[in-house]
Every structure is written in C-alpha cells, then in structure tokens.
C-alpha cells in the first residue's frame, strides 16, 4: 500500500535569464527511494538521479541543468520556452512510483519572483 505523499514547489515563477530550483520531497513513507527522474513539459527526461550511481543528465541540458540541491534540480539561463510543467518521478521500494508536478512560468518582467510553497534550504 502506498502511504507516501509528494510535496513540491508547486506553481513558481522566475525571471528570463535567471535560475530556479525544482524541488520535490517524499514524506509519510519508509520506502527506499531508488531513483528520481525529472521530466519536462513535453515529457522528455531532463535528468535521472539513481541512489547509487548518482546523476545522469540529458546531454542537451548539460549546460543549463545543475544537479541538486538534494534530489532537486536547478534550471539555469531560463528562456521563455522553459515555461510549462515539470514532473518528479520517485521510484521507490517497496511502494512503487510517486509523481509530483511543478508549474514553472518564466517571466520577462524584472519583478518576477521565485516563490514556493515548499523549499529545502
């Protein structure tokens, strides 16, 4: 039985050219996290973080994606095309798969703020 819940940074906004942290957190379960996959709005993979093998970042994003903090992902040099949904998929044992959603809006405005409901310092 899957008892865990995923908390995410929810709906966030950030400035074009800036950076943003995508963060998910799995709670209320003792399941072992074996891998976390990060997917973009077109459902393509951005990166994988395996518990033993570490990070594996899709080559096209290597210059703009930084691993962490923790199991999160930092997107850098943001463009308007980065606007959209992002998904964290937690593969766990023995529970199975948990999935979280984040919506990122990239703004031209200099007053864009990166606000989050949840953030790991």
């Amino acid at each position: 039985m899957m008892t865990g819940t995923i908390e995410t940074t929810g709906n966030i906004s950030a400035k074009k050219g800036g950076s943003v942290i995508l963060q998910c957190h799995l709670s209320s379960t003792m399941a072992q996290v074996t891998q976390v996959n990060w997917e973009q709005h077109d459902h393509s993979l951005l990166a994988i973080r395996n518990a033993e093998l570490g990070w594996h970042i899709y080559p096209a994003f290597k210059d703009r994606v930084a691993p962490g903090p923790g199991l999160g992902l930092t997107l850098q040099s943001l463009t308007m095309n980065d606007t959209g949904e992002y998904f964290c998929t937690y593969h766990t044992y023995p529970d199975g798969t948990y999935r979280g959603r984040i919506f990122l809006e990239v703004l031209e405005s200099s007053v864009a703020e990166h606000s989050a409901r949840f953030q790991i310092p």
Epitope: T34, Q35, N37, L45, I48, N50
Partner: antibody, heavy 114, light 107 residues
C-alpha cells in the same frame, strides 16, 4: 586511460564462497558509483549489484539478495563482491562497471559446480 | 520490472548493408536507453546512451533513435569489425534491465 581489472574468480562447490575484486585506475574512483554485471554462459547480461561513490548505499538484484555483498575501498581504488551460498546458476563471467556503464572490465569467470 | 525485448535475436548481412536492430520496452521509458556492443570473447562496450547520443569514439555509422517503448539501433554500412552481439538496456527505473541481445554476423 580508464582501466578496470577483475580478479578472484574460479571454480567453487555449491554452497561455497568467493570474493571478487576490481582494481580501478585512470579516473577518480571515489567520484563514481560502481556495479557488478554478470553474464551466464551463452546468455545475456544481468545487473547484480551497485554501490554509491562513498559506499554508503548499495543495491542488489533479488536473485542474489542475502547471499552477495558489494563493497568498496576508496583508499585502495578497489571494488569488491563477496559471494556466499553460491549456486550453480551463479556460474557466469562477472564484470566490474563504472558509473552509468561507460567502462567495463575484462571480466572474471566464476564456475559453481560439484 | 521493465522487460526489454530485442529483435531479431540474430541476423546475417553483407558488408556495406544497412542493419537495423529493434528494442521494445514493456512500459514507457522515455529516452532512458543505452546500447552496447559485445564482440566475441570480449566485454561489452557502450555505444549509445540517452537513446541517441553516441559515446565518444564510436563510429558515426552507429546511430540510435526512439522514445517511449520502441527503439532502434542502426548500422548504416556494416563493417567486418561490427560482428558482435548488441544489447539494449533501460535505466528509467530500477532494477535496470537488458534486452536478450541480437547477434550480428557477416554473410
């Protein structure tokens, strides 16, 4: 040049034990997760065990859980696979593999037979 | 666990032929797929990762494509040194699993 050199294979009776070693060179060993992958005679590839760069986290295939242990000594640039309660179906070539499978050793042969 | 199915299990082609090997995943694995070449008596060698990215030093005649559940490894012009068994592997979720292999021979 990245080099992974396995040793410790041999002929062992069912129920016996072996310890495989993999000597790594040509890269910063302590920065990479490592794996053991095996290949039974004439068969395909099976991921047996993986270990974090620091050694703090390991994962074992269901087929070997409770019998095999993966470990590493970063000060010696060496990866290990301790194999206990060996069975005939463990007969295979065992490969030491770096990271996301970008470099493989030459393999060491384990034969379990009475 | 995700099952990986390769086809054909073996093939024979002439030097210079275009060769295509397919790999099918039992569920969506996005582009988390690698291809390996294993020459007789040797250890496997990484050819392609992230479904279509050639590993450094791999000849350009090798290419990978696909996303989701269906993937292809193509050798644009088969060479004698390409005689080997080719394996696909998914790394979308643990445990990482390999296909059964495709043995490529020269006619």
């Amino acid at each position: 040049e990245v080099q992974l050199v396995e040793s410790g294979g041999g002929l062992v009776q069912p129920g016996g034990s072996l310890r495989l070693s993999c000597a790594a060179s040509g890269f910063t060993f302590s920065s990479y997760g490592m794996s053991w992958v095996r290949q039974a005679p004439g068969k395909g590839l099976e991921l047996v065990a993986t270990i974090k760069s620091s050694g703090g986290s390991t994962n074992l295939a269901d087929s070997v859980k409770g019998r095999f242990t993966i470990s590493r000594d970063n000060s010696k640039n060496t990866l290990y696979l301790q194999m206990n309660s060996l069975r005939a179906e463990d007969t295979a070539v065992y490969y030491c593999v770096r990271g996301y499978f970008d470099y493989w050793g030459q393999g060491t042969t384990v034969t379990v037979s009475s | 666990d995700i099952q990986m199915t390769q086809s054909p299990s073996s093939l024979s082609a002439s030097v210079g032929d275009r060769v295509t090997i397919t790999c099918r995943a039992s569920q969506d694995i996005k582009t988390a797929l690698a291809w390996y070449q294993q020459k007789p008596g040797k250890s496997p060698k990484l050819l392609i990762y992230w479904a279509s990215t050639r590993q450094s030093g791999v000849p350009s005649r090798f290419s990978g494509s696909g996303s989701g559940t269906d993937f292809t490894l193509t050798i644009s012009s088969l060479q004698p040194e390409d005689v080997a068994t080719y394996y696909c592997q998914q790394y979308y979720s643990t445990p990482y699993t390999f296909g059964g292999g495709t043995k490529v021979e020269i006619k």
